[in-house]
Every structure is written in structure tokens, then in C-alpha cells.
């Protein structure tokens, strides 16, 4: 079974800076799976943000401003990253990575 680890327990950033969150996959090859990122703002339901497929195709939640989030995956290190540009107060949340496995 696949196991996901987000090494950073928390990330503190100055307003307008860039935050980079990491997700490390083990127990399953990341090369063929799609990785999904979600966020949970305080007091709100969890929300899908963006996903990236095996070949670097991305899907983003329609309401998300263009250029706000950038997702990547590095199969060699079994890692996916979520970059949050121009950090603002409404970006305060818990961010989760997930994957579908057969």
C-alpha cells in the first residue's frame, strides 16, 4: 500500500512570499499515479486545489486564481510539490496531498 509523508509539519511565510510544500510517496511507484492536493481552511470543508498526472498534465479547481498554485512531481525522488505564490492571509490552512491507487 502507498504511504504519503509531508515532511514539513508547518510552514511560516511572510506575506507576498512563496511557500513550497512537499509530499513524499513510498510503497508505490509514483511514476504512474496521479497526485492530488487539497486544503482545509480553519472552520471550512476540505477543498480540492490541483492535481498532476503521470505525464505532467494538471487539473485545477475552477475557482482558483490563475498562477496562485503550481504543482510538480519528481518521479526520481517520489516527490510532489505544491508551490503557493504570493502568500496572503486567506492561504492560512492545512494542506494535504493524496493519491489514488489501484
Amino acid at each position: 500500500a502507498g504511504h504519503l509523508e509531508q515532511p514539513q509539519i508547518s510552514s511560516t511565510k511572510t506575506l507576498s512570499k512563496t511557500a513550497r510544500l512537499e509530499c513524499v510517496v513510498s510503497g508505490i511507484t509514483i511514476s504512474a499515479t496521479s497526485v492530488y492536493w487539497y486544503r482545509e481552511r480553519p472552520g471550512e470543508v476540505i477543498q480540492f486545489l490541483v492535481s498532476i498526472s503521470y505525464d505532467g498534465t494538471v487539473r485545477k479547481e475552477s475557482g482558483i486564481p490563475s498562477g496562485k498554485f503550481e504543482v510538480d512531481r519528481i518521479p526520481e525522488t517520489s516527490t510532489s510539490t505544491l508551490t503557493i505564490h504570493n502568500v496572503e492571509k486567506q492561504d492560512i490552512a492545512t494542506y494535504y496531498c493524496a493519491l489514488w491507487e489501484v
Epitope: 511507484t29 505532467g56 498534465t57 485545477k60
Partner: antibody, heavy 118, light 107 residues
Amino acid sequence: EVQLVESGGGVVQPGKSLRLSCTASGFTFGTYGMHWVRQAPGKGLDWVAVIWYNGSNKYYADSVKGRFTISRDNSKNTLYLQMNSLRTEDTAVYYCARGGFGESFDSWGQGTLVTVSS
Amino acid sequence: DIVMTQTPATLSLSPGERATLSCRASQSVIDYLAWFQQKPGQAPRLLIYDASNRATGIPARFSGSGSGTDFTLTISSLEPEDFAVYYCQQRSNWPLTFGGGTKVEIK
């Protein structure tokens, strides 16, 4: 309607270079991984290369590694394949194809013929 | 690299008959397998993805099954337009690899 149109093929001598282009329309090009696939005359399909939506990652078949370079210009909705040190065995129809999640390779161009001959 | 082997190389059948095409992977590809149809002078067309899912607009007579290393494409009743070459492809690992193809010809 999704459309992919390849161009740049032709006859070239061994050792020379050629650059193929694939112009996309009908979808948000900048969110898709894109592939090149080739087919030698009378032969099967042969995957060549892929590039991530933002160009951050590229993978190649062993047969073209170090000689071919895949790139893209999202502002022009265009995918490229720079082919250097061409060999006779590179003679093929070259197709670009759209990536995706499960349903990848759901759209292909019409192909462009590259002939490497002295 | 994962080697994909398709059998038979050629299948001679009549319209209305059932076609069963096989694809075997040299190692497990889980269910990350696609099937394509190609007619002379045309680009390939995606039929099945992730082993058993029909692509958009593909008729129900096409079905895919299998997982791990052994996969099957079935055409329940051949139509005249189904006579073509069929390829399987794995996306479990880079580099992506295709099978050598099965030609379905009119008997």
C-alpha cells in the same frame, strides 16, 4: 474541437538536424503534458518523449536520448522536437499527442514524415 | 524497459465475428494499459484506457480486461470499419512502451 498539427518534416542527410513543431488548438495547451510518438514505415508505434505542462520534467526513449530535445512554448500553444545527429533509423512519421490523466493519448496530430537518407 | 508482446500478429476474421486480442507485459503494469486502433494513413485512435475504460465516443462492442501482466481487447461483433491494426501501450513506467501490434484482417 481539439486539434494538433505537426510541421517541419522533410528529407535530411544523416548527421544533420531538424526541428518539428506541433501547434495545438481547442484546449488549454498549458495544462497538458505532451508527447512525441513515431512510426517507421510499415512498423509499429514508438514512444519518443514527453514534457510536463510547465516544461519542468522531460523524459526520452533510450534510442533518442542525448540527440533529441523536447520543448514547448505555452504562449504560442506549440510543442517542439529538436532532432540532432539524425540517423537513418530515425526515418518515421512523427506524431504529437496530448497527455492526460487516465484518458491520455486521446488526441493525435496527423503526423509529419521525416526521412533521413544520404 | 517493460516489453509489451501482442498475440496473434494477425487475426483473420469475418464481419460479425468476435475478436480477442492479447497483450502481455514483461512485468506488472497494474492496470495502466491502453489500447489503440490505427487504420492505414491515419493517426492512432485511443479505444481503451486503464485496462477497461472506454474512451469518449468508442462503441460498446470494444471492451478491455486484465491486470498485472495479461490483458485482452475484445471486439464483440466485428464491423467493417474495425479491420485495422491494434496496439497496446503501458504507462506504468518510463519509458512508455507499445506492443508490436495485431492486425485484424478480413477473412
